[in-house]
Amino acid sequence: SYHDRKSKVDLDRLNDDAKRYSCTPRNYSVNIREELKLANVVFFPRCLLVQRCGGNCGCGTVNWRSCTCNSGKTVKKYHEVLQFEPGHIKRRGRAKTMALVDIQLDHHERCDCICSSRPPR
Amino acid sequence: SYHDRKSKVDLDRLNDDAKRYSCTPRNYSVNIREELKLANVVFFPRCLLVQRCGGNCGCGTVNWRSCTCNSGKTVKKYHEVLQFEPGHIKRRGRAKTMALVDIQLDHHERCDCICSSRPPR
């Protein structure tokens, strides 16, 4: 019947959605200093929102324990932030310790579910 | 100047975004059997996409290690799925082993950053 066919289509779509959209780029805040590995610099804001892969993989499959959600495509994006550096006292005028700078952070554009096991036969 | 004010506004917004949107409801696939703690029942689909809290908290703060992203509001939502139960041989006719059923799964509607330490003085 129409209802049975509709239910089958709906269930197939739900099944597909659970596999397809459980490992996707998501918002994470990253500490700029840690991300850029810079010790003696302070940024404002301290943290920025980036897209990183998250979620889970292989739900309902035999190998789900061996599967992780990894970046399949990473791009570097520019962000304009304020950078403060330790100021040194100058003879003439004040040290310029603050500047607007462009920094690059990794953003994950595509996420893949990768499994370290072999596929089930 | 206008440019300085605009930069300040933009940076404040970036700062706010990193705090506001790093702990939010996100897609996760959950195994229905495990979620409902039912051992001898099979569902199709095996897994469904639900909204669960994820991301990170307290980036750039002293206490960030003590902060977790938790559900601030959880709602139960209905999902129509196929349920297969182990069939028993009946005297008259075949056992009805398959049925469309409504199941309830938790969805996180709001996420809060909960920190176990005291706020910094």
Epitope: C113, I114, C115, S116, P119 | -
Partner: antibody
Framework: QVQLVESGGGVVQPGRSLRLSCAAS????????MHWVRQAPGKGLEWVAI????????YYADSVKGRFTVSRDNSKNTLYLQMNSLRAEDTAVYYC????????????????????WGQGTTVTVSS | DIQMTQSPSSLSASVGDRVTITCRAS??????LAWYQQKPGKVPNLLIY???TLQSGVPSRFSGSGSGTDFSLTISSLQPEDVAAYYC?????????FGQGTTVEIK
Amino acid sequence: QVQLVESGGGVVQPGRSLRLSCAASGFTFSSYGMHWVRQAPGKGLEWVAIIWYDGNDKYYADSVKGRFTVSRDNSKNTLYLQMNSLRAEDTAVYYCARGYYYDSSDYLYYYYGMDVWGQGTTVTVSS
Amino acid sequence: DIQMTQSPSSLSASVGDRVTITCRASQGISNYLAWYQQKPGKVPNLLIYAASTLQSGVPSRFSGSGSGTDFSLTISSLQPEDVAAYYCQKCNSAPWTFGQGTTVEIK
């Protein structure tokens, strides 16, 4: 049986081009990521490039970026490596190897190393 | 990019000896590590994948362990046919870097 056969190697002058081919048989070629790996005389293995199962994504070693192009024709079960602006340091045996398996029904990539290798084809860049 | 460092670069051992080769990744790669054997004049052959899973057809004297950044390949009892170069490789994302290799010889 599962097999990879490379061809197209030879002696070429610096700055010239060469195209290597790798014919696959015995498996569903269009479900696998495919690699090129090379080995200079007396040296270790060097990963060169990978192409995704569908040809949409390609990644290269820094040493060949901008000079080499990997491609595939799934209808012919064939992998290619177009090598331009060849240098003496590109002299090596070039292997094609089968990489990950992509399960399109579960959207899962199975990464378990390179389990099938071709016999290799020799490229000599010399004036 | 993640670097893979193998040690030692070569070793010589007696038949029956237990031999261990180590591989270190400059950043964590979970268990996405493979080991290959390449006998003189031959094509490389996959020995171990997922850091510790033996490829079918590989003798059980070979074993792998480790996770994250530190990995090892062990031959429990070295045989004459094990004379070869051994390579580790990260296999979770580009670049699929190999270690520089370890040559195993019989004393």
